[in-house]
């Protein structure tokens, strides 16, 4: 069959999902493209337990997640309901801050150095985390 039964090389298994943690940065859209080309998606955080797991692996580094409000309301990339789901924003965030001088507000969410979330300019080259569920699709490719 085509179902994935174990995580590929360099991915980490946790609670029936596979996670891949980048060590370099890309803009949110390009990180999203990377994950999709790998038959995955930017990480969707659905619980405090998953938050702690991801936070442990990324350390104190700004890191994109699969949450954005580029089309208005906040949305998770996999369709998980935002309003009723887990949230871990920093105090007074998200604030759609326009004062950065880069044009527009802040439409993409990332983990900050303490793990809590902030909205930021989507073009910033942050690290990112991909996630894919086991038993969903074919195995990911090995590395070059």
């Amino acid at each position: 069959g085509s179902e994935r039964t174990c995580c590929p090389v360099n991915w980490v298994e946790h609670e029936r999902s596979c996670y891949w943690f980048s060590r370099s940065g890309k803009a949110w859209a390009d990180a999203d493209n990377y994950c999709r080309l790998e038959d995955a998606h930017l990480v969707v955080v659905t619980s405090w337990e998953e938050q702690k797991f991801v936070q442990h692996h990324i350390g104190p580094v700004n890191t994109w997640m699969g949450l954005h409000d580029q089309n208005g309301p906040w949305k998770w990339v996999d369709g998980t309901d935002y309003e009723t789901g887990f949230k871990n924003w920093r105090p007074e965030q998200p604030d759609d801050w326009y004062g950065h001088g880069l044009g527009g507000g802040e439409d993409c969410a990332h983990f900050t150095d303490d793990g809590r979330w902030n909205d930021d300019v989507c073009q910033r080259p942050y690290r990112w985390v991909c996630e894919t569920e086991l038993d969903k699709a074919s195995q990911e490719p090995p590395l070059l």
């Epitope: 360099n10 370099s24 999709r36 080309l37 790998e38 038959d39 990112w128 195995q139 490719p141 070059l144």
Partner: antibody, heavy 122, light 107 residues
Framework: EVQLLESGGGLVQPGGSLRLSCAAS????????MSWVRQAPGKGLEWVSA????????FYADSVKGRFTISRDNSKNTLYLQMNSLRAEDTAVYYC???????????????WGRGTLVTVSS | EIVLTQSPATLSLSPGERATLSCRAS??????LAWYQQKPGQAPRLLIY???KRATGIPARFSGSGSGTDFTLTISSLEPEDFAVYYC?????????FGGGTKVEIK
């Protein structure tokens, strides 16, 4: 032997259609994203389209968006490019290429076919 | 989209000489840069990825360096089979883009 073999090229009139195929062998095809890259006669390389291993995600260059469709049949180890509304500027050698993934999060073309020539002319 | 500018367009050298090829990006691509070699009538071949890592089977005389916007491919001592066209390619931003190429020809 690890290889990619393109077919389906030929002469087609402007506005016409063509379907390219790429037969893969020697590696686990459905594990890898794949891509098409083209090269106009005497010119440089241009990325055209890419597809994830399962086929669930597809990507296109602006120059072909809405006209070309990339797909794959993993049971046949074959990649396809359906080209519609062809224009003279689509004339090129079309290469099928396997996308390798690096630790840093890059995608590069680590295996190429020999290419198939598509000529769009009346 | 990111524009990659390669220079020089043509490099005329003799076997045994050192070749230095440049690739400049219109904005930072971090280290998401690859180099390919293409000989007449053949498909391209991956030489270098992530700016400085040699692909499988590539001889040590090929090396890549740089990050951000400025990158270099160096061939330490040209062999007869190295005379070809070389392309750089970035995977920092969608769409993937290639440079216009540098032809290394026999002087």
């Amino acid at each position: 032997e690890v290889q990619l073999l393109e077919s389906g090229g030929g002469l087609v009139q402007p506005g016409g259609s063509l379907r390219l195929s790429c037969a893969a062998s020697g590696f686990t095809f459905n594990n890898y994203p794949m891509s098409w890259v083209r090269q106009a006669p005497g010119k440089g390389l241009e990325w055209v389209s890419a597809i994830s291993g399962s086929g669930s995600a597809t990507f296109y260059a602006d120059s072909v968006k809405g006209r070309f469709t990339i797909s794959r049949d993993n049971s046949k180890n074959t990649l396809y490019l359906q080209m519609n509304s062809l224009r003279a500027e689509d004339t090129a050698v079309y290469y099928c290429a396997k996308l390798g993934t690096t630790v840093s999060g890059g995608h590069y073309f680590d295996l190429w076919g020999r290419g198939t020539l598509v000529t769009v002319s009346s | 989209e990111i524009v990659l500018t390669q220079s020089p367009a043509t490099l005329s050298l003799s076997p045994g000489e050192r070749a230095t090829l440049s690739c400049r990006a219109s904005q930072s691509v971090s280290s998401y840069l690859a180099w390919y070699q293409q000989k007449p009538g053949q498909a391209p071949r991956l030489l270098i990825y992530d700016a400085s890592k040699r692909a499988t089977g590539i001889p040590a005389r090929f090396s890549g360096s740089g990050s951000g916007t400025d990158f270099t491919l160096t061939i330490s001592s040209l062999e007869p089979e190295d005379f070809a066209v070389y392309y750089c390619q970035q995977d920092s931003n969608h769409p993937l883009t290639f440079g216009g190429g540098t032809k290394v020809e026999i002087k």
